[in-house]
């Protein structure tokens, strides 16, 4: 199809090599008086959609994206060309950065119901640099954290740097939605609930003398609680001894609680005691079982191909450590009898 | 530096219509949002609205309707269209440049409209 | 419909005075935070004194600061300047931004 009459906006995704990102575009299709399709639920350009910025068809995903070649060959479907980029609803996701996304993405509605509809798509020119070590030395973090039931705020990475009376208008989007009435650098939240979680991205323009682009950054906002005071605990075993049978095989499973921590290492391990000598076991790799904003539940299992007369005059422990300490549960093993 | 100066404000007969005018300087109407907000003599402040970047406008309940705000990018211009001018009109209007919703972070010094027959 | 009310309209202040401004709102300010606090001096423009309800603006004087949330909120100034005397607004931001607007003023003179 002709790309000719496409609305075309620029975009620009500066990146920062320390770390991973991700980045979106939206098929913002046009405000227009033009095409059914594109209506927006009827909202006259002067007002604002709540919901999406994408209006444009009652089915979201019944949109298609390409890219365009630099080199003037056909466009290319994105789903089947692009497996780095992923398609949900009418957002485009990249989930790497690099300079080979530079590009041209075009989006248009599938379903072409009349010879107006053609018209209605929109070009997004897309430029992907990697950040400049001139640039601000501690820009915002593209994962941020809020901490559950106190104040916090999201920051803009790209426009971290600058105060809040310089920083030009910023338009937010939360997961898609526009937040219409937060227009600056920073989302200052007044009490964090787990709603405030999600992907965030911030958008504003930059100008100069030839034409004006917007620059994008994406945000991952997780909620957390504060990090644990405690050490964890062992949820099991819980006694002392276990009553094995003499050349069956075994497997004792420790089960430890870690509180939440913000730098989570969790350290989850068996070790033997015979005598006076100790030795860590090679065994299964740990498992979270249960996860939840306040703690994860670990698991580690040792396991023995048969049990032996040896290893009832042995201990069998279980050491567990968080930032806080550690702690220890050792077993007995002990045969049954009759 | 950031400056920003009101002009177009005269005595006019209730009834008409009249457009402010607030050039900008040392900043782009394309990266900032813009506001409008009068004082009758003697009175306080109210908040008439606000023009985003994009364009997008929103006005105080009292102002839709009669009152429109504009913008000229390339002109560095913003525009406030008043029309069926009443005598309660009669105020210094002001532009801000507005971050956020709120705050009016730098004002124009003002231009002052009297609407009287 | 939105009622923004300042107390008290006027206050007689001395230099060295600390001097406590009220605002409330209702409904609730968007996000609980979204207050501002103006300075108006006459033949001039308004001034941004504090925004999000207690940041203090660029090259604001410490004496000045504002505390609360949601509908209560506080404009304080510890220790009266002769500069001080002025009127204040207190300025809310809500979710239908076509709602946003101003306190009634308070006027603080000279006693």
């Known amino acids: 199809f002709n790309i000719s009459g496409c609305s075309t906006k620029k975009l620009l995704w500066t990146y920062s090599t320390r770390s991973e990102e991700e980045f979106v575009l939206f098929c913002d299709l046009p405000e227009p008086q033009k095409s059914h399709f594109c209506h927006r639920n009827r909202l006259s350009p002067k007002q604002v959609p709540e919901h999406l910025p994408f209006m444009g068809s009652n089915d979201l995903s019944d949109v298609q994206w390409y890219q365009q070649p630099s080199n003037g060959d056909p466009l290319e479907d994105i789903r089947k060309s692009y497996p780095h980029i992923i398609q949900d609803k009418c957002t485009l996701h990249f989930l790497t950065p690099g300079v080979n996304n530079s590009g041209s993405y075009i989006c248009r509605p599938k379903m072409i119901k009349s010879p107006y509809d053609v018209a209605c798509c929109v070009k997004m020119i897309l430029e992907v640099k990697p950040q400049t070590n001139a640039s601000c030395e501690y820009s915002a973090s593209h994962k941020q954290d809020l901490l559950l039931g106190s104040t916090g705020s999201i920051s803009c990475p790209s426009l971290s740097c600058q105060s809040d009376a310089q920083s030009p208008a910023v338009t937010w989007y939360k997961n898609g939605k526009l937040l219409s009435v937060e227009r600056s650098n920073r989302i200052v939240v007044d009490e964090v609930y787990d709603y405030h979680q999600g992907t965030y991205v911030c958008d504003y323009t930059q100008s100069d003398t030839v034409s004006s682009w917007t620059v994008r950054a994406v945000v991952q906002v997780r909620t957390i609680v504060g990090d644990t005071k405690l050490k964890p605990d062992i949820l099991d075993p819980v006694e002392d001894t276990l009553e094995v049978e003499l050349g069956k095989p075994l497997t004792i499973s420790c089960k430890a609680r870690f509180g939440f921590e913000r730098v989570f290492n969790p350290v989850i391990k068996w070790y033997i005691k015979d005598s006076d000598l100790e030795w860590e076991v090679s065994v299964p790799e740990a498992k979270s079982i249960k996860s939840t904003l306040k703690d994860e539940i670990i698991e580690r299992n040792i396991i023995l191909e048969k049990v032996t007369q040896r290893d009832l005059r042995r201990k069998f422990v279980c050491f567990v450590q968080n930032s806080i300490g550690n702690t220890t549960q050792s077993v007995q093993l002990k045969e049954k009898r009759g | 530096e950031v400056q920003l100066e009101e002009s177009g404000g005269r005595l006019v007969q209730p009834g008409t219509s009249l457009r402010l005018s607030c050039a900008v300087s040392?900043?782009?109407?394309?990266?900032?949002?813009m506001s409008w907000v009068r004082q009758a003599p003697g009175k306080g402040l109210e908040y008439v609205g606000i023009?985003?970047?994009?364009?997008?406008?929103y006005y105080a309940n009292w102002a839709k309707g009669r009152f429109t705000i504009s913008k000229d990018t390339s002109k560095t211009t913003l525009y406030l269209q008043m029309n069926s001018l009443r005598a309660e009109d009669t105020a210094t209007y002001f532009c801000?440049?507005?971050?956020?919703?709120?705050?009016?972070?730098?004002w124009g010094q003002g231009t002052l409209v009297t609407v009287s027959s | 419909d939105i009622v923004m009310t300042q107390s008290p309209s006027s206050l007689s202040a001395s230099v060295g005075d600390r001097v406590t401004i009220t605002c409330q709102s209702s409904?609730?300010?968007?996000?609980?935070?979204?207050l501002s606090w103006f300075q108006q001096k006459p033949g001039q423009a308004p001034k941004l004194l504090i925004y999000?309800?207690?940041t203090l603006a660029s090259g604001v004087p410490s004496r000045f600061s504002g505390s609360g949330s949601g509908t209560d909120f506080t404009l304080t100034i510890s220790s009266l300047q002769p500069e001080d005397f002025a009127t204040y607004y207190c300025?809310?931001?809500?979710?239908?931004?076509?709602?946003?607007?101003f306190g009634q003023g308070t006027k603080v003179v000279i006693k």
């Open positions: 801000a440049r507005t971050h956020n919703t709120l705050p009016f972070y730098i």
């Open positions: 023009i985003y970047n994009s364009g997008t406008t």
């Open positions: 040392g900043f782009s109407l394309n990266s900032y949002d």
């Open positions: 409904p609730s300010v968007y996000n609980n935070n979204r």
């Open positions: 999000y309800a207690s």
């Open positions: 300025a809310g931001g809500y979710s239908s931004i076509s709602d946003n607007g």
